[in-house]
């Protein structure tokens, strides 16, 4: 699986999850998030050669098409597969609010 | 929606579904598919600016991050959203077989 366990431990050029730390205030301008100050959102990148963690029949077909037609612009793209939520703390006035934001952290990738 | 109805009628630079005809024999080397000889598989391409058909909270966050940090390599990617099956005819010996291949035709795209 192209997950953090594999990708963070290997120098993988092809599609894999990469570490990306996002600071809410600095990188997004979100001053309203009190905690955490930032988090590892991660991202997916790298080429998708034929059959690499293909998401659908279409991505398999497109991967093969791209292999046999290297000049073609059409190829599968490395995108998030499994995502996890992030719990944040913010304030409405002086009242603390806790909210779980879904699909905030990429744990694995696929070729789609 | 970034679907064929919209994308095929507009000159859209950003993420959209694009027409792509694939000939089974010529483009994939699949001589075993008797009918059809080829089909419009289509593909997704184009930049994913902030908020453009964002698939998850993560892609929204990544889009904003990319907007505020243009030098960053992390950005959402334009990938298939809705796919349709394709029915094919092939032969096992002299016996014709009809099979529906799932997720073969891209009908719309999203930024993931």
């Amino acid at each position: 699986a192209l997950d953090t366990n594999y990708c963070f431990r290997n120098l993988e050029e092809n599609c894999c999850v990469r570490p990306l730390y996002i600071d809410f205030r600095q990188d997004l301008g979100w001053k309203w998030v009190h905690e955490p100050k930032g988090y590892y959102a991660n991202f997916c990148s790298g080429p998708c050669p034929y059959l690499r963690s293909a998401d659908t029949t279409h991505s398999t077909v497109l991967g093969l098409y791209n292999t046999l037609n290297p000049e073609a612009s059409a190829s599968p793209c490395c995108v998030p597969q499994d995502l996890e939520p992030l719990t944040i703390l913010y304030y409405v006035g002086r009242t603390p609010k806790v909210e779980q934001l879904s699909n905030m952290v990429v744990k694995s990738c696929k070729c789609s | 929606a970034l679907d064929t109805n919209y994308c095929f009628r507009n000159l859209e630079e950003n993420c959209c579904v694009r027409p792509l005809y694939i000939d089974f024999r010529q483009d994939l080397g699949w001589k075993w598919v008797h009918e059809p000889k080829g089909y419009y598989a289509n593909f997704c391409s184009g930049p994913c600016p902030y908020l453009r058909s964002a698939d998850t909270t993560h892609s929204t966050v990544l889009g904003l991050y990319n907007t505020l940090n243009p030098e960053a390599s992390a950005s959402p990617c334009c990938v298939p959203q809705d796919l349709e099956p394709l029915t094919i005819l092939y032969y096992v010996g002299r016996t014709p077989k009809v099979e529906q291949l799932s997720n073969m035709v891209v009908k719309s795209c999203k930024c993931s």
Partner: antibody, heavy 117, light 102 residues
């Protein structure tokens, strides 16, 4: 590499004020929170407050309300901690520490403040 | 303010052994916890952040676990140089309080 260099030891009388500096280098000073902490002799650690040098935003430990002032000079990458109305219980080692990813990852060497009559 | 309670107050072990220490938060802090090691005359050194992640340059003999209110720091293959005070600290809303140390 990240480096936080603090000012030297200070001795003050009760009721006086003390101002300690913390000069940062090796990272983007304006875009990381700076925490201030202290540790009394043979005691545990206590978080005092934090400042975001980029816009001067601060969060204080209510225990020090009115006595603690945190500032930052972005032209010299220096953070300052001023504590007023000192009492003997304020005798401690004072630390600045960079906030990163739910921790304080880099610390200054500490500045000893002694409050004695 | 969130109260952090560490146990035990002190701990002894032999070289090569495994030891564990605990930290309990008075309310849910999710995974927003760090562990530090402090040797006499030195400033604290970050060991673990976000409850389970090993800080740069820290031997993998150290590991953190837990989420919510209960957390554990484990030192396996204990070494003489591990003699120190260990503190937990939460990062879930200011003030960021520390445990009393082990």
């Amino acid at each position: 590499q990240v480096l936080l260099v603090q000012s030297g030891a200070e001795v003050r009388k009760p009721g006086a004020s003390v101002k300690i500096f913390c000069k940062a280098s090796g990272y983007s000073f304006t875009s990381s929170w700076m925490n201030w902490l202290r540790q009394a002799p043979e005691q545990g650690l206590e978080w005092m407050g934090q400042i975001y040098p980029g816009d001067g935003d601060t969060n204080y430990n209510g225990k020090f309300k009115g006595r603690l002032t945190l500032t930052a000079d972005t032209s010299t990458n220096t953070a300052y901690m001023e504590l007023s109305s000192l009492r003997s219980a304020d005798t401690a080692m004072y630390y600045c520490a960079r906030h990163y990813d739910g921790s304080t990852d880099y610390w200054g060497q500490g500045a000893l403040v002694t409050v004695s009559s | 303010a969130i109260t952090m309670t560490q146990s035990p107050g002190s701990l002894a072990g032999s070289p090569g052994q495994q030891v564990t220490m605990n930290c309990r938060a008075s309310e849910n802090i999710y995974s927003n916890l760090a562990w530090y090691q402090q040797k006499p005359g030195q400033h604290p050194k970050l060991l673990i952040y976000a409850a389970t992640n090993l800080a740069d340059g820290v031997p993998d003999r150290f590991s953190g676990s837990g989420s919510g209110t209960d957390f554990t720091l484990t030192i396996s293959n204990l070494q003489a140089e591990d003699v120190a005070s260990y503190y937990c600290q939460h990062f879930w809303g200011t003030p960021y309080t520390f445990g009393g140390g082990t």
